[in-house]
């Protein structure tokens, strides 16, 4: 059997491999050692017994989408049946005091691989026995502690494979410089040690995306905006736009990034090198926001001008492929997809990202101020309580609701929250009366709201003992 027979549904073409060369990966035309690594089809009854106590689930994730030329990282995590975990030695053990369907286990080990490897690997001094090899026959790398790595992961994509020895979690990074744009499929097959052979325990696949568009996200924030996710904002208050570029491998770290904004309100283009920008809309309506991000990223060098016609015949591309596929070294530039590149030359290519949003601008409450506070004299039966009137003004639209949150002087521990509808005149002047139980310093947060906005003001007040001679003080 060949790798593509085992790992994929169909034999990938050489064309696919040639157009998607992954550095350090091997062609899936290579032979697979079925004696050491048995192959079971989906539905084979042997899967039921591939793991003690249930099935192992493999979870494959990636930091896709990846900008072409950057690295994409794949992570595989194994999820064991209930009550099982990997210990520091790489053995699979039962968790203490954990009950599963079989009850508490007397044997602490699900798989004691340490004991197995001590029994079976003593046949030569190197520790490199004929079974410590990957499915293609390559020997396991002897990193420190490699004997505690008991899982073999075979990654397969674009007609190529990559083998990795690991524990219950592994990561593999792939450079996408030569990967065709668009969605691609990554498949992973996981084997576990089983004496002097291996047993398949899980298979998983996931789609990843390679793009030549910079992946761009924009967050928008505006003070007093009631709902930041509905793309409705308030007139006459600045909106802060923050551009996030998805670049987990830091491919663009050394690039100069330019942000070109069009806010759709006839204010023209705004170009910046800062990822945040503030913009205030002064009219109500619907506006089309457009952002173009431009970065000079590392990229392939442009083809040199065509040389004068050769007097001797040029080697054919088919010959080129043959020498490349069979891993026999050829003259520089034999790689067909490198024909147009100049070795060791650092060329740059402009990459672009785009973001578009439709923004609705409406009237809202722009500002709220407490202009006066008055202690309301109360009849004698309530000596512990104080009634205070807050005279409040606002700017912008007319509020429909007022809320007061009374808390401790640090403004962290809420003691009392009261919300009530309000009916305010055009002048936006209202009085809010609130009760304070006992003397002391209080933090008062007062918000005025309508359907789209929520404006806040805060103050610290000092409520005196019920001595008529002591005045009410605004602590700040």
């Amino acid at each position: 059997k060949r790798f593509h027979d085992v790992l994929g549904n169909e034999r990938p073409s050489a064309y696919m491999r040639e157009h998607n060369q992954l550095n350090g990966w091997s062609s899936d035309e290579n032979d697979w050692n079925e004696k050491l690594y048995p192959v079971w089809k989906r539905g084979d009854m042997r899967w039921k017994n591939s793991w003690k106590g249930g099935r192992v689930q493999a979870v494959l994730t990636s930091d896709s989408p990846a900008l072409v030329g950057s690295n994409i990282t794949f992570a595989v995590n194994l999820i064991f049946p209930r009550c099982q975990k990997e210990d520091a030695n790489g053995n699979i053990v039962y968790e203490k005091n954990c009950r599963n369907e079989a009850g508490l286990s007397a044997d602490p080990y699900v798989y004691n691989w340490t004991a197995w490897s001590e029994d079976s690997d003593g046949e030569n001094g190197t520790g490199q026995s004929h079974h410590n090899v990957f499915p293609d026959g390559k020997p396991f790398p002897h990193h420190p502690g490699w004997r505690r790595w008991n899982f073999i992961y075979v990654f397969h994509t674009l007609g190529q494979y990559f083998q990795k020895l690991g524990r219950c979690s592994v990561r593999v990074s792939v450079n996408t410089a030569n990967v065709t744009l668009g969605p691609q499929l990554m498949e992973v097959t996981v084997y576990r040690r089983h004496g002097r052979a291996y047993v398949p325990i899980a298979q998983v696949k996931d789609v990843y995306v390679v793009t030549d568009q910079i992946p761009v996200f924009v967050t928008m924030f505006q003070k007093n905006d009631r709902n930041s996710s509905d793309e409705t904002f308030l007139k006459d208050l600045p909106i802060m736009f923050d551009v996030l570029i998805h670049d987990p491998s830091h491919f663009l770290n050394y690039s100069t990034i330019n942000y070109k904004w069009s806010f759709g309100d006839n204010t023209g283009l705004f170009v910046s090198t800062n990822h945040t920008v503030n913009h205030t809309y002064v009219l109500n309506g619907t506006f089309s926001l457009n952002l173009t991000v431009k970065a000079a990223a590392p990229g392939p060098c442009p083809p040199p001008p065509p040389p004068p016609r050769p007097s001797k015949p040029t080697p054919s591309l088919a010959t080129t492929l043959k020498s490349y596929d069979s891993n026999t070294p050829g003259p520089a530039g034999d790689n067909p997809l490198e024909l147009s590149r100049i070795p060791d030359e650092n060329c740059q290519i402009n990459r672009y990202g785009h973001f578009q949003a439709t923004i609705t601008i409406v009237e809202g409450i722009l500002e709220v101020n407490i202009i006066q506070m008055t202690d309301v004299l109360m009849p004698v039966p309530w000596p512990e309580s104080s009634l205070i009137d807050f005279v409040v003004t606002c700017q912008g639209s007319i509020p429909t609701e007022v809320c007061t949150i009374i808390s401790d002087p640090t403004c962290e521990i809420t003691q009392n929250t009261v919300c009530s509808p309000v009916d305010v005149d055009e002048m936006c002047l209202l009085t809010v009366r609130r009760t304070f139980n006992g003397s002391g310093t209080y933090c008062v947060n007062l918000t005025l709201g309508d359907d789209t906005s929520l404006a806040l003001t805060s103050t610290l007040i000092s409520v005196p003992d019920r001595d008529p001679a002591s005045p009410l003080r605004m602590a700040n």
């Epitope: 169909e10 034999r11 990938p12 073409s13 050489a14 064309y15 696919m16 040639e18 157009h19 998607n20 072409v68 674009l158 065709t180 744009l181 668009g182 691609q184 030549d212 990229g299 392939p300 442009p302 083809p303 054919s316 591309l317 088919a318 492929l321 067909p336 997809l337 024909l339 147009s340 590149r341 290519i349």
Partner: antibody, heavy 119, light 107 residues
């Protein structure tokens, strides 16, 4: 919908060069390799080469190496095929064709450009 | 280069009858083989890719089969509009190569 629109017919003298354009629309231009295939009158189809619109990488068939140059203009979503040192046997209809991602079959073709080489 | 050999060069079949075209590759290209139909004055039209997958909108009377080096295009019931030249193409490796074509006519 996907469209590949090629430039008009050309008549050239032997030894001259011809540059044929192919303007793409209806899909993400940079995501698919573009190929050039030619067909001499009454003959079969012959693959000339391909270009990656994303970064300008090219592969040419050995027969045309040194005589063909494929280029791309991303701003107009157009690829170009220039054939130099023309001879009478280069008289043919030249097609651009879009590949299917990682697969080199062609679901989309230009309408063809007839290049006549005659003294 | 992979050489693609088509047979027969031409084929005359009665309306409603089965037409079979063969294509042989000089090396294993499985399953990377496509079939095209070309009518006079038009570009080729993709019928089958990856040996047996019918392209969107292609009538189901067209089917592809085969593996390794031997492939077949079958038109199960020939219609008048099927009169054309048919080409096979290997999409296994560069340089991409086409068969010489098979002309299908009505008997």
């Amino acid at each position: 919908q996907v469209q590949l629109v090629q430039s008009g017919a050309e008549v050239k003298k032997p030894g001259a060069s011809v540059k044929v354009s192919c303007k793409a629309s209806g899909y993400t231009f940079t995501s698919y390799w573009m190929h050039w295939v030619r067909q001499a009158p009454g003959q079969g189809l012959e693959w000339m080469g391909e270009i990656n619109p994303s970064d300008g990488r090219t592969n040419y068939a050995q027969k045309f190496q040194g005589r063909v140059t494929m280029t791309v203009d991303k701003s107009t979503s157009t690829v170009y095929m220039e054939l130099s040192s023309l001879r009478s046997e280069d008289t043919a209809v030249y097609y651009c064709a879009r590949s299917g991602g990682n697969y080199a079959w062609f679901a989309y073709w230009g309408q063809g450009t007839l290049v006549t080489v005659s003294s | 280069d992979i050489v693609m050999t088509q047979s027969p060069d031409s084929l005359a079949v009665s309306l409603g009858e089965r037409a079979t075209i063969n294509c042989k590759a000089s090396q294993d290209v499985s399953p990377s083989l496509a079939w095209y139909q070309q009518k006079p004055g038009q570009p080729p039209k993709l019928l089958i890719y990856s040996a047996s997958y019918r392209y969107t909108g292609v009538p189901d009377r067209f089917s592809g089969s085969g593996s390794g080096t031997d492939f077949t295009l079958t038109i199960s019931s020939l219609q008048a509009e099927d009169v054309a030249v048919y080409y096979c193409q290997q999409h296994y490796s560069i340089p991409l190569t086409f068969g010489g074509g098979t002309k299908v006519e009505i008997k």
